[in-house]
Interface confidence: medium
Amino acid sequence: EAHKSEIAHRFKDLGEQHFKGLVLIAFSQYLQKCPYEEHIKLVQEVTDFAKTCVADENAENCDKSIHTLFGDKLCAIPKLRDNYGELADCCAKQEPERNECFLQHKDDNPNLPPFQRPEAEAMCTSFQENPTSFLGHYLHEVARRHPYFYAPELLYYAEKYNEVLTQCCTESDKAACLTPKLDAVKEKALVAAVRQRMKCSSMQRFGERAFKAWAVARMSQRFPNAEFAEITKLATDVTKINKECCHGDLLECADDRAELAKYMCENQATISSKLQACCDKPVLQKSQCLAEIEHDNIPADLPSIAADFVEDKEVCKNYAEAKDVFLGTFLYEYSRRHPDYSVSLLLRLAKKYEATLEKCCAEGDPPACYGTVLAEFQPLVEEPKNLVKTNCELYEKLGEYGFQNAVLVRYTQKAPQVSTPTLVEAARNLGRVGTKCCTLPEAQRLPCVEDYLSAILNRLCVLHEKTPVSEKVTKCCSGSLVERRPCFSALTVDETYVPKEFKAETFTFHSDICTLPDKEKQIKKQTALAELVKHKPKATEDQLKTVMGDFAQFVDKCCKAADKDNCFATEGPNLVARSKEALA
């Protein structure tokens, strides 16, 4: 239904607190360099304006679109060109081109320092003094570093942050209470960020149809008792919601997400038996709970999928009559039977089925031609199963850090042209798959591993797109989203790469490494490892092990020395010489 004032409508639906949070996220995601104080001033102005429109929908400018109102606010910022360069050119455009222009200038890797968590005491003091401002800073800092973060979900994490601080800041040992809890929130939020970026990439590159196929598969796995048309309705709504958030329509996105949660809770009988616990929660928690809901039990009496999709004499007729619907039903029926498959795999199988029908329905004897299609799925299913098996075995043998290093070597060999920080970040994230997925029950491993890897590889693609340096990476990133992971897995050592010159300064370390937190120490070592591989792409596992072992001992020894600086200065060149020799 149309509303006289879109902004008044959203303000009333969302309530002031969520409205302000979403406006802050929107501004922080568009203008990533602006300080919090500047954004919060704009948020207050927009909120005050929204209130005037709630009081009188006919008031001046209340009929303007939210993009127009937000864009006008952003373009009125003084010194916009000084701080943002060509992004200021967007302001010369009219809506909707202006918003499109803002979206194109979102930076996935902004030049911002890593978000440092303050000391527990300091954190509690500022939280207790002004919780609203404290949580506002959290929204701002996360949103500017993750310009595609799913806004209603970020509000949920801010709520979690609030809960943790409220609980822990009354404890005597605040740090002991805060650290593990905030680490858990951070870990979940970082995974959410890469997953949502993948969804926006899917939407941007391949459109709504591709995203809807993803949603149909996912919903069918979760709600195997829901009928196809119900799944279609849910997938259509989820597609619309994600399109809005990816497109910067955060108020509409959050409002529609709350509506979908309401619909699901009102229609539990036709969706899933598992929803009730979620439906008793307040709105943000309800939506999050529904998004993470466990799979419903598969109906016991499902007939073989072959009946409708292989044995039926009318397969080609049904397909020709309504291709998308027929393929959608195939994806639905296959997915609801296989919660143990990744969505990527299910989409590959649907693609294979589609290609088979395209080919066979044009031939003389279609049933004979497509009769073996389900058997032809076998290699497509075996490939990711083997990937999971070998990688989880390696993870169990090496542990997380060792597994990350193995992945780092592998990926540096595949794409040595990619910048070392990007390779290290990707390998560290890819390596976490072990901790995240390999400990799960067998039936949950494959979907966990492959869908997580796909999201991490999407991040690699997004960063590489900004400064393309490797033809192989470009090739894998340009293809279909569901083929990306198999494409990367199939890459071998890049034979075209000319090894990097050995630079002693790359492997020169100082005593400052000793005071770094463990994570930063690991990153330093992994940076050195990637550089070694770039210098010697064909170095054997044993050679690399020797050099890295030597390096670890050197750091350990010098950090324990009385005169650390002297130790690093004298032992460092010896290490470099030994390393060169070991790799010769």
Epitope: F228, E230, K233, A269, P303, A307, D308, E321, V325
Partner: nanobody, 126 residues
Framework: QVQLVESGGGLVQAGGSLRLSCVAS????????MGWFRQAPGKEREFVAA?????????YYADSVKGRFTISRDNAKTTVYLQMNSLKPEDTALYYC??????????????????WGQGTQVTVSS
């Protein structure tokens, strides 16, 4: 959008049989669960039978027709059928065909996306 047209109604003796058909136009027939409802003069519309979106789909029946009526569908012909055997005078009603997202909601006579036909009259004389 789905348009539905019923046929096959008529006058029949108690104990006789009739086969109702409902043809759907629109390219998304396969996406919908299909069902039959009936309304006797002066009474509420009541659920008769429903079938999920596939030809061999799950079927649901009202207790009053179980074992006598059979619902089936032919997706190629975008048609749903209701085979009515051992008809009784109390089966006399206007029979409606319906399309909805869910066969389960149809049983509760509250289709979420209700598409209705105009109805076909069935009269069973004793």
């Amino acid at each position: 959008q789905v348009q539905l047209v019923e046929s096959g109604g008529g006058l029949v003796q108690a104990g006789g049989s009739l086969r109702l058909s409902c043809v759907a136009s629109g390219r998304t027939f396969i996406a919908y669960a299909m069902g039959w409802f009936r309304q006797a003069p002066g009474k509420e519309r009541e659920f008769v039978a429903a079938i999920t979106n596939f030809a061999g789909g799950t079927t649901y029946y009202a207790d009053s027709v179980k074992g006598r009526f059979t619902i089936s569908r032919d997706n190629a012909k975008t048609t749903v059928y209701l085979q009515m055997n051992s008809l009784k005078p109390e089966d006399t009603a206007l029979y409606y065909c319906a399309a909805d997202r869910s066969a389960q909601t149809m049983r509760q006579v509250r289709p979420v996306l209700p598409y209705w036909g105009q109805g076909t009259q069935v009269t069973v004389s004793s």
